[in-house]
């Protein structure tokens, strides 16, 4: 008699999963020399610690402690860039500009990205049918709670002056519900942290707006000011100029505004 | 280039010790999981036994468990397995591999040596 398996609304586990954490791992430690400590073996033994034999739908913080110890690496706090619904943008960026990073450039969001990933309550198996979704099924699930792990921990680690990448073709250019707007806004440090400055990323190419003054961003000026937090903005008009300028600063095109 | 040169194999008696080594080559030794995958006359591979890359994991194949025991020198970039209490069965050529880790069961091999051919014999 087959076994009854709970069907979930979103998609299963990626394919080929222990593999490809493991291979990122390795391919990590070998290109970052100050991780080189760490052990692959133990990084995905806790990671499929944290959600193996566990309802997915009951996965806590808790549970991945033992691979965020394992996986503890110190950034520069003064070079963190966060994003909101323009990963790509933010990661071509950070390829470009060597010294800043955003988590996925971090070993534990560099395992993670683009990955899904749960088990089933009392058995061992990973689950490649289905995972739970956040919206239709539940938000304790092992991807959404592995992301606000690591995005809050990222952000309470940030200091001095922390950049953060908007999507200026989006409805909500910040969003309250974003892991941005809902986890990494409320955990920079004040103590530490002197200015938030977002970059508004134009998609149009004769889009002139100043989306500084859109009245999401206004609400974020808000959020971040009450916490004691200077709060600046920036519209980023040609996203290809700026990063071709990123790449080349000294080319005369890139005195005049991007 | 990789490469995963086994030494140590020969001849011994049932009940007697052998100590197999590699040395290592052409990687970043430190990073990787290295295991002894061996293929006894006439039958599929088989998964001996795994270390990871610190050596603070380690794995073994039931058939092996006890008798056998891995380590490595990541300052020598060498993987060792010492083996006793050795059976007619355990005759096989072994090969020392290199990979990303395993789960469970499953090893993720990258690279693997020649082999060096182990006989337990009396």
């Known amino acids: 008699v087959p076994r009854w398996r709970q069907q979930w609304s979103g998609p299963g586990t990626t394919k080929r999963f222990p593999e490809t954490v493991l291979a990122r791992c390795v391919k990590y430690t070998e290109i970052h020399p100050e991780m080189r400590h760490v052990d692959c073996q133990s990084v995905w033994d806790a990671f499929k610690g944290a959600f193996i034999s566990k309802h997915p739908c009951n996965i806590t913080e808790e549970d991945y402690q033992p691979l965020m110890k394992l996986g503890t690496q110190t950034v520069p706090c003064n070079k963190i860039l966060l994003w909101s619904r323009i990963k790509d943008l933010a990661h071509q960026f950070t390829q470009v500009q060597r010294d800043m990073f955003t988590l996925e450039d971090t070993l534990l969001g560099y395992l993670a990205d683009d990955l899904t990933w749960c088990g089933e309550f009392n058995t061992s198996k990973i689950n490649y049918q289905s995972c739970p979704d956040w919206r239709k099924d539940c938000s304790n699930n092992p991807v959404s709670v592995f992301w606000k792990t690591v995005s809050r921990r990222f952000a309470e680690a940030a200091c001095d002056v922390v950049h953060v990448m908007l999507n200026g073709s989006r409805s909500k250019i910040f969003d309250k519900n974003s892991t941005f707007g809902s986890v990494e806004v409320h955990n920079l440090q004040p103590e530490k942290v002197q200015t938030l400055e977002a970059w508004v990323i134009h998609g149009g190419r004769e889009d002139s707006r100043d989306l500084c003054q859109d009245p999401t961003i206004k609400e974020l000026e808000s959020i971040i000011s009450k916490r004691n937090i200077q709060f600046s903005c920036k519209n980023i008009y040609r996203p290809d100029k700026f990063l071709q300028c990123v790449k080349n600063p000294e080319d005369s095109s890139c005195t005049s505004e991007i | 280039e990789v490469q995963l040169l086994e030494s140590g194999g020969g001849l011994v008696q049932p009940g007697g010790s052998l100590r197999l080594s590699c040395a290592a080559s052409?990687?970043?030794?430190?990073?990787?999981?290295m295991s002894w995958v061996r293929q006894a006359p006439g039958k599929g591979l088989e998964w001996v036994s795994g270390?990871?890359?610190?050596?603070?994991?380690?794995h073994y194949a039931d058939s092996v468990q006890g008798r056998f025991t891995i380590s490595r020198d990541n300052s020598k970039n060498t993987l060792d397995l010492q083996m006793n209490s050795l059976r007619a069965d355990d005759t096989a050529v072994y090969y020392c591999a290199s990979g990303k880790g395993w789960d469970g069961n499953t090893w993720y091999e990258d690279y693997r040596g020649q082999g060096t051919l182990v006989t337990v014999s009396s």
């Open positions: 052409g990687f970043i030794f430190s990073v990787y999981a």
């Open positions: 270390i990871s890359g610190s050596g603070g994991s380690t």
